[in-house]
């Protein structure tokens, strides 16, 4: 997960945009990525980075938990 997120974040050269991506990675079981992104007011650039990283992180976590279930962990 960390490697993949770092790969995505590396393309964002504006520090705030990069941090928007990292914010998206934080675990939040109560809201979807879309719901969380809707509260961002600093600009669409941040929304896009947040959403991309949030979705990728969610997918990777889902895949990992699915693998764990298959392995009977």
């Amino acid at each position: 997960l960390q490697e993949k997120i770092e790969e995505i974040a590396a393309k964002y050269k504006h520090l705030v945009v990069k941090k928007c991506c990292y914010d998206g990675v934080r675990i939040n079981h109560d809201e979807t990525c879309e719901q969380r992104a809707a509260r961002i007011s600093v600009g669409p650039r941040c929304v896009k980075a947040f959403t991309e990283c949030c979705v990728v992180a969610s997918q990777l976590r889902a895949n990992n938990s699915h693998k764990d279930l298959q392995l009977g962990r």
Epitope: H14, V16, S41, V42, G43, R45
Partner: antibody, heavy 118, light 111 residues
Amino acid sequence: QVQLVQSGAEVKKPGSSVKVSCKASGYTFTDHIIHWMRQAPGQGLEWMGYIYPREGWTNYNENFKGRVTITADKSTSTAYMELSSLRSEDTAVYYCARERNLEYFDYWGQGTTVTVSS
Amino acid sequence: DIVLTQSPASLAVSPGQRATITCKASQSVDFEGFNYMNWYQQKPGQPPKLLIYAASNLDSGVPARFSGSGSGTDFTLTINPVEAEDTANYYCQQSNEDPHTFGGGTKVEIK
């Protein structure tokens, strides 16, 4: 309407520090980044750094080698730029500006003249 | 850091003529199809004023005689036709990456 109002002119001695304020009004202060630029007499614009008041995130121009500190007071919607170890080359007009959509500077302060002289 | 090179450093134009200023970036300021290049006008004793954002978008209240074009590394600000009140310094600025950088400026004088 959106306004950025800066503090008044300063005259400082070499080696001292200066702290310039930038009071924002007419919009939600925490929604936009505040940048600081400076302009030496007859010269172009030099970017110094910024702060995102909502999170307190900052980034600085490495040319200032740790001499610059940018802070923000959300309770008063005011951003501050402090420059230390002043030298004569720091004599300039200092500007704050709001960055809209993380793309461009749409509103600027009126500028603060800082003169460094012994 | 992205270095922005403006040319010419100064130019004198007659009223009604066209003024063209170029800004060349040391690396692309395009990100996923969006060009983070802006243009500002600065008159003596005043702060800079936004003219053009995202390479070609005119800011509200800016006269239509100002236009911007370009992508990647090469950008142009055009004033056509030039008016007497356009005497000022003009700066390009990129916001694609930190540190944000400005061009060295172009001084436009009206003959």
